[in-house]
């Protein structure tokens, strides 16, 4: 008799999940010579630790504590780049802005960009059909958790200025219950940040209108002026200006605003 | 098994540029960095850069940095490496290559090579 | 960048001597080394990595050694297959770099 298996509402475990995980450890470390010291393999057993095995509504951080120590990492904590609802661009940024990183520039935003995972409880089997949907199901999922784990201990390390990526598109250009919204505006550390800056990514190619004085984003400087951190905010009104002026600043066409 | 292979021989113009291919075979394109390295005639090898081809992400050689562009077709299981502004210089065998996670980072596969050869 | 200086260049020995060439890099690389047998219009083989690990299917008359910034390639007995080129690598930072070649020919 086939056992009774939970059906979430979230799609499941993306296929060759452990596979994926190793190889993309193994790869991170050849791009970064810096982590050659990392163990793939042991990465690779706290990974599989924080969840197998363990109901999938029931995940804690304590749970991904293994992976987040053998995953610890030093990036510079003054070339920190945050982002909301706009990933493409932001890592496009870091792509061509070498010394400035995003949180999946790091090993374990590497290992488990654009992945989902869940297992069973009292099982070693992942779960390749189904995964709890955060709204829907649970938010102390495994994915969920994780995000909220390794994006805490992101802003956390941020000092000095901390630039965030916003899409101006959006009808919440700053969502409170974004990861950036929920969890990395209320863990940057006042005693070390200095300043925010928010960069408003303009979607629309005559748009000139100030997003800057969106209310949402008053709601934002609001929130970190009660954290006693500076508030400043840029508009990017041609993205795709923008990446070719970081590619080549010295470009006749840079000095005008973009 | 695994095999990486690589577009035929091109002869170019002084300026012009050269788009050479590698089709990888036998193992999960996206599981492995591609390198490409090469080598002019009589000389030793040269490292150029290198690609993800899950994320696209790439780093060049300082020295091919402004005409070198190395991109990845995940549907094709395809490597390209376009050098543009070629100078005789450039005539050269190009060879794809990546590693295998068990040997360090040491290349232990190579595709058959490309020569590329500059004329005025 | 990180310099390999090779040597020597060229390298005449007969089948079954011993053979070693020698390797030097212009700072520490630790044992990210890989050393490479290549014959005319073919592609590099990778013989040993780690400095001093035998790759798949390399003959044990192979061997490596060394860390830091000396590195060596053995060949203990010469077979008539090995008259060919040979190239060591760093790996231990980008830009990865070969050094210039040792020419192992019959005498």
């Known amino acids: 008799v086939p056992r009774w298996r939970q059906q979430w509402s979230g799609p499941g475990t993306t296929k060759r999940f452990p596979e994926t995980v190793l190889a993309r450890c193994v790869k991170y470390t050849e791009i970064h010579p810096e982590m050659r010291h990392v163990d793939c393999q042991s990465v690779w057993d706290a990974f599989k630790g924080a969840f197998i095995s363990k109901h999938p509504c029931n995940i804690t951080e304590e749970d991904y504590q293994p992976l987040m120590k053998l995953g610890t990492q030093t990036v510079p904590c003054n070339k920190i780049l945050l982002w909301s609802r706009i990933k493409d661009l932001a890592h496009q940024f870091t792509q061509v802005q070498r010394d400035m990183f995003t949180l999946e520039d790091t090993l374990l935003g590497y290992l488990a960009d654009d992945l989902t995972w869940c297992g069973e409880f009292n099982t070693s089997k992942i779960n390749y059909q189904s995964c709890p949907d955060w709204r829907k199901d649970c938010s102390n999922n495994p994915v969920s958790v994780f995000w909220k784990t390794v994006s805490r201990r992101f802003a956390e390390a941020a000092c000095d200025v901390v630039h965030v990526m916003l899409n101006g598109s959006r009808s919440k250009i700053f969502d409170k219950n974004s990861t950036f919204g929920s969890v990395e505006v209320h863990n940057l550390q006042p005693e070390k940040v200095q300043t925010l800056e928010a960069w408003v990514i303009h979607g629309g190619r005559e748009d000139s209108r100030d997003l800057c004085q969106d209310p949402t984003i008053k709601e934002l400087e609001s929130i970190i002026s009660k954290r006693n951190i500076q508030f400043s905010c840029k508009n990017i009104y041609r993205p795709d200006k923008f990446l070719q002026c970081v590619k080549n600043p010295e470009d006749s066409s840079c000095t005008s605003e973009i | 098994q695994m095999q990486l292979v690589q577009s035929g021989a091109e002869v170019k113009k002084t300026g012009s540029s050269v788009k050479v291919s590698c089709k990888a075979s036998?193992?999960?394109?996206?599981?492995?960095?591609m390198h490409w390295v090469r080598q002019a005639p009589g000389q030793a090898l040269e490292w150029m850069g290198w690609?993800?081809?899950?994320?696209?992400?790439?780093d060049y050689a300082q020295k091919f940095q402004d005409r070198v562009t190395i991109t990845a077709d995940r549907s094709m299981s395809t490597a390209y490496m376009e050098l543009s502004s070629l100078r005789s210089e450039d005539t050269a065998m190009y060879y794809c290559?990546?590693?295998?996670?068990?040997?360090?980072?040491?290349?232990?596969?190579w595709g058959q090579g490309t020569l590329v050869t500059v004329s005025s | 960048d990180i310099q390999m200086t090779q040597s020597p260049s060229t390298l005449s020995a007969s089948v079954g001597d011993r053979v070693t060439i020698t390797c030097r890099a212009s700072?520490?690389?630790?044992?990210?080394l890989a050393w490479y047998q290549q014959k005319p219009g073919k592609a590099p083989k990778l013989l040993i990595y780690?400095?001093?690990s035998l790759a798949d299917g390399v003959p044990s008359r192979f061997s490596g050694s060394g860390s830091g910034t000396e590195f060596t390639l053995t060949i203990s007995s010469l077979q008539p297959d090995d008259f060919a080129t040979y190239y060591c690598?760093?790996?231990?930072?980008?830009?990865?770099?070969f050094g210039q070649g040792t020419k192992l020919e019959i005498k």
């Open positions: 290559a990546r590693s295998a996670h068990t040997t360090g980072f040491g290349f232990a596969y």
């Open positions: 036998g193992y999960t394109f996206t599981d492995y960095i």
């Open positions: 690609i993800d081809p899950e994320y696209g992400r790439t």
């Open positions: 700072e520490d690389i630790y044992s990210n």
């Open positions: 780690d400095a001093n």
């Open positions: 690598q760093q790996y231990n930072n980008y830009p990865y770099t």
